[in-house]
């Protein structure tokens, strides 16, 4: 393992590598640790403000975590010759607030990308597709990890955060080969319609620890390869028949529904019936009611139709203050 730990006197990293000299095959950038045997470069917790230009050509796994990158420009990893072996890129916790279109272009082997724990005020629609064409060249990405990328409220753009992320996921249909998508802990209130329709190859989808209230307008129908769907720790109140039927129709899926505030009233009857007969839900015996108060902590699987009633709504003429 070689490492280069230089002081502040080391030459600053260039913003663009277009004019940079090709790196020596075994060169290790300042402030990084390199292992050619493991094909790994780690530039971790070094307060880097830019991606090193002189990354070794052998790099297959690149860790740029815990830095202060702020912005990933177009072609941030473009090199001559290209980093043709780079397969896994971890940029988590690097204070990124802007990822521009084409940021990951010229990485032909990039299979796994982790942008978690960056407060992304701006994620270009073309961050992953690289172009604004209606149909882009397929991205090589197989795993995309976007946990906790929601910016603080004061840094949000006018448009919805959910919409911004969705636009990047569907642009150019570039991510049709994506197998794994993690979107946990992003304060999502809803999942934009048609996003999942553009991701037909998903095997693993993590939407846990968001604020999803309903899945009524979400279609899982075409996710025929889905094996794990994580919906724990959301704000789901009930799953309606359409959603239940779609989940039941997915041949290999397992759904995780723990820690949602299930409302056990008359609208819950179909879901309870479904839970009792389905093998789709993992840990279904742990699901409990949160509302109404009289039902709190009751186990869904133990409920029957007589338990699930709705208070009659008084006609306006009978309502009193």
């Amino acid at each position: 393992t070689s490492s280069a730990s230089s002081s502040s006197s080391s030459a600053p990293f260039l913003a663009s590598a277009a004019s940079a000299q090709p790196p020596l095959p075994d060169q290790c950038p300042a402030l990084c640790e390199c292992s050619e045997a493991a094909r790994t470069v780690k530039c971790v917790n070094r307060n880097l403000t830019e991606v090193p230009t002189d990354l070794p050509l052998y790099v297959r796994n690149l860790f740029l975590t815990g830095n202060q990158l702020a912005v990933l420009p177009a072609g941030a990893f473009a090199r001559r010759p290209p980093l043709a072996e780079l397969a896994a890129l971890n940029l988590s916790g690097s204070r990124l607030d802007e990822v521009r279109g084409g940021a990951f272009e010229h990485l032909p082997s990039l299979r796994q990308l982790d942008l978690s724990h960056n407060p992304l005020a701006y994620l270009s629609p073309f961050a992953f597709s690289g172009s604004n064409a209606s149909i882009s060249a397929p991205s090589p990405l197989v795993e995309l990890i976007l946990n906790h990328i929601v910016p603080p409220d004061d840094k949000r753009q006018n448009r919805s955060f959910e919409g911004m992320v969705a636009a990047a996921l569907v642009a150019g249909r570039a991510l049709q080969g994506l197998h794994l998508l993690e979107l946990a802990s992003n304060h999502f209130l809803y999942l934009p319609r048609d996003v999942l329709a553009q991701l037909p190859s998903l095997r693993y989808l993590d939407l846990s620890n968001n604020s999803l209230v309903s899945l009524t307008y979400v279609s899982f129908r075409n996710l025929t390869h889905l094996e794990s769907l994580h919906l724990e720790d959301n704000a789901l109140k009930v799953l309606h028949n359409g959603t239940l039927a779609e989940l039941q129709g997915l041949p290999h899926v397992r759904v995780f529904l723990d820690n949602n505030p299930w409302v056990c009233d008359c609208h819950m009857a179909d879901m309870v019936t479904w839970l009792k007969q389905t093998g789709v839900v993992q840990g279904k015996d742990r699901l409990t009611c949160a509302f109404p108060e009289k039902m709190r902590n009751r186990v869904l699987l133990e409920l029957n139709s007589a338990d699930l009633d709705c208070d009659p709504i008084l006609p306006p003429s009978l309502q009193t203050s």
């Epitope: 197998h179 095997r203 693993y204 025929t224 390869h225 094996e227 290999h252 093998g279």
Partner: antibody
Framework: EVQLVQSGAEVKKPGESLKISCKGS????????IGWVRQMPGKGLEWMGI????????RYSPSFQGQVTISADKSISTAYLQWSSLKASDTGMYYC????????WGQGTLVTVSS | AIQLTQSPSSLSASVGDRVTITCRAS??????LAWYQQKPGKAPKLLIY???NLESGVPSRFSGSGSGTDFTLTISSLQPEDFATYYC?????????FGQGTKLEIK
């Protein structure tokens, strides 16, 4: 990096029992199905069955139902294929593979059953 | 169980040739078909799924087509590393059967 590492080659006599293993790493083992495939010497691939390690739900090919048992221990990220009474016709290479679409494969375990 | 029949069982071709392998299902399997490549002494490798979707990292000279019961794998310009055995597999219903294989040899 996703890896499936299988146990080593086995030489057994007819009637003996055997349990071979497949250890997954580099991914969430409990979140993807794991399948087993047999390849007899000089022959093609045969789908034996799959298991979801998260809840040990297993599906078998009718050709192998009752002949083998597929199991998993999620605490050590390992899937198993076992026989209670081997036959000479069980000789072959056995592969484990991840996901219903077998996107990653183990290196194979050669099982030889001979008296 | 759904049966898959590949043809031809073996095939001789030269580098640069265009090669087509077919797979016929005994009943309709929608688009639930995959193709694998296996080289001697190695584990198989997923090439294509859902009839025509290329697995990440697979060269674009490989392509798949078809629907219902009849499917094809095409290699547009054979490379030396493509000489291997190819299998189709259906995952429309259990058991997820394989075809018997097509051995692609150097002419």
């Amino acid at each position: 990096e996703v890896q499936l590492v299988q146990s080593g080659a086995e030489v057994k006599k007819p009637g003996e029992s055997l349990k071979i293993s497949c250890k997954g790493s580099g991914y969430r083992f409990t979140s993807y199905w794991i399948g087993w495939v047999r390849q007899m010497p000089g022959k093609g691939l045969e789908w034996m069955g799959i298991i979801y390690p998260g809840d040990s739900d297993a599906r078998y090919s009718p050709s192998f139902q009752g002949q083998v048992t597929i199991s998993a221990d999620k605490s050590i990220s390992t899937a198993y294929l076992q026989w209670s009474s081997l036959k000479a016709s069980d000789t072959g290479m056995y592969y484990c593979a991840r996901s219903v679409l077998f996107d990653y494969w183990g290196q194979g375990t050669l099982v030889t059953v001979s008296s | 169980a759904i049966q898959l029949t590949q043809s031809p069982s073996s095939l001789s071709a030269s580098v640069g040739d265009r090669v087509t392998i077919t797979c016929r299902a005994s009943q309709g399997i929608s688009s639930a078909l995959a193709w694998y490549q296996q080289k001697p002494g190695k584990a198989p490798k997923l090439l294509i799924y859902d009839v025509s979707n290329l697995e990440s990292g697979v060269p674009s000279r490989f392509s798949g087509s078809g629907s219902g019961t009849d499917f094809t794998l095409t290699i547009s310009s054979l490379q030396p590393e493509d000489f291997a055995t190819y299998y189709c597999q259906q995952f429309n219903s259990y058991p997820h059967t394989f075809g018997q294989g097509t051995k692609l040899e150097i002419k």
